[in-house]
Amino acid sequence: GPVWRKHYITYRINNYTPDMNREDVDYAIRKAFQVWSNVTPLKFSKINTGMADILVVFARGAHGDFHAFDGKGGILAHAFGPGSGIGGDAHFDEDEFWTTHSGGTNLFLTAVHEIGHSLGLGHSSDPKAVMFPTYKYVDINTFRLSADDIRGIQSLYGDPKENQRLPNPDNSEPALCDPNLSFDAVTTVGNKIFFFKDRFFWLKVSERPKTSVNLISSLWPTLPSGIEAAYEIEARNQVFLFKDDKYWLISNLRPEPNYPKSIHSFGFPNFVKKIDAAVFNPRFYRTYFFVDNQYWRYDERRQMMDPGYPKLITKNFQGIGPKIDAVFYSKNKYYYFFQGSNQFEYDFLLQRITKTLKSNSWFGC
């Protein structure tokens, strides 16, 4: 059956049961994911907006799939195997009484079972397994996966050691707070900012100081290291990633099939062999592509280059250039341009630099 073809998996709690405090729901779901991340290379991250891989839903009766709930008792929950759209989603019957303890139906225990399905596990015939088809309360403080559960999930994803990086002195993880740190590409992805460098990316969740480093291959195994440019069209849940003369399309954090494609399909002349940086401006519905000391402007609606390009970067972005490493769009009025270890906040309405920063200023360095 199917599995997630990446190790970084997002989840979102769509709505909350009134039976429990929101914090208790968050905690139960987080701990349930942790049960599986403890024994695999998988990493789970909760997002609050946008498309998550796994959507957690509390619903009663008919709720948009073929499997209407049946009132109190009977079916407690169900979850879909890995995949796009509804794939991975976990639905909990709101007609049950959800609890943190042995009364009613324990959300944590039920969630561990359902997340097992979300990750690709079927039912187990071992009555001691959490994947056994019938619900039975066990003390959640001493709860452990059975050997059968662990065998099953590790047959799909391997054990946690497979997530640990082998030392690679030629391509080791860059020091995040090195004052000379530069980035290959930067883009927003929903409420996050992705910073690419060599074979790594850092994930910065807006307004939070905490960041995490990941291997590009752990999120997108089919993508190369050394991403050179990236941009997001948030309204379409699309991210475009560029390396050399090729680009990849990521939809809802999943690579689309039939990629990479040639950058020349955008309309670049043949002499353009790579893109240095790219940024999409949703106000104008245009993407700006930066190549050496020039830039092109692409109409995403008409799917063609605007006439009159390329233009010089220095001529139209006062104080920026002649070349840039990376750029992203934020807060509805700023481009953040990266040149080596420096970063420039550029107000595209005023058409001038409003702040000069270090490239790693986003990380509280």
Epitope: G1, P2, N14, M51, L55, V57, A59, A62, H63, G64, D65, F66, H67, H78, A79, F80, G81, P82, G83, S84, G85, I86, G87, H117, G122, R236, N237, N252
Partner: antibody, heavy 122, light 103 residues
Framework: EVQLLESGGGLVQPGGSLRLSCAAS????????MHWVRQAPGKGLEWVSG????????MYADSVKGRFTISRDNSKNTLYLQMNSLRAEDTAVYYC???????????????WGRGTLVTVSS | DIQMTQSPSSLSASVGDRVTITCRAS??????LNWYQQKPGKAPKLLIY???SLQSGVPSRFSGSGSGTDFTLTISSLQPEDFATYYC?????FGQGTKLEIK
């Protein structure tokens, strides 16, 4: 390349029976939910029936419940629809459609056959 | 049972126009809504799944939005090949269809 090819349609009298087949290729048939969807002449789409990957779980629209039976033979990569007690209102093009993998059906029909016409008339 | 109401039932537009079709569910279906295109004599084709995800191979002028009960299919700039009938769907329920015709 995913392909679905329906067969078995034709003209049948009211009260008669017909068995439709859908031959699948280009994917691991035994992993996927499969469905029948029909379309009466000049009308919209109507879901008819669905079956789980193993064949152990079946679902029917109220309009065909008790008259139609969906089944599958995973060794032959084939989906079936046995239609009994046919009525004039069952006249339609019948499409087979592929759904997702897994224990539950999403009703996400990503590949469709070309359809086979069933005409119920005296 | 959940009902799906699609509007309008027919629509005339010209090449290059921006077109919007809406679909309303009688109760929340979260983001579990799909859109299909069907041309005369052909099988339906999946365009958008999970309300806003573009099916592979579908041109990016098609987009979907919405969650809960209200959903929209938008074609940003109509092309000649887009004149067809469009259906929304969740589980076993299809909308009545919207026939998009050339003005």
């Amino acid at each position: 390349e995913v392909q679905l090819l329906e067969s078995g349609g034709g003209l049948v009298q009211p009260g008669g029976s017909l068995r439709l087949s859908c031959a699948a290729s280009g994917f691991t048939f035994s992993w996927y939910w499969m469905h029948w969807v029909r379309q009466a002449p000049g009308k919209g789409l109507e879901w008819v029936s669905g079956i789980s990957p193993s064949g152990g779980y079946t679902m029917y629209a109220d309009s065909v419940k008790g008259r139609f039976t969906i089944s599958r033979d995973n060794s032959k990569n084939t989906l079936y629809l046995q239609m009994n007690s046919l009525r004039a209102e069952d006249t339609a093009v019948y499409y087979c459609a592929r759904d997702i993998v897994g224990p539950y059906s999403a009703g996400l029909f990503d590949y469709w056959g070309r359809g086979t016409l069933v005409t119920v008339s005296s | 049972d959940i009902q799906m109401t699609q509007s309008p039932s027919s629509l005339s537009a010209s090449v290059g126009d921006r077109v919007t079709i809406t679909c309303r569910a009688s109760q929340s279906i979260y983001t579990y809504l799909n859109w299909y295109q069907q041309k005369p004599g052909k099988a339906p084709k999946l365009l958008i799944y999970a309300a806003s995800s573009l099916q592979s191979g579908v041109p990016s002028r098609f987009s979907g939005s919405g969650s809960g009960t209200d959903f929209t299919l938008t074609i940003s700039s109509l092309q000649p090949e887009d004149f067809a009938t469009y259906y929304c769907q969740q589980a076993g329920i299809f909308g009545q269809g919207t026939k998009l015709e050339i003005k």
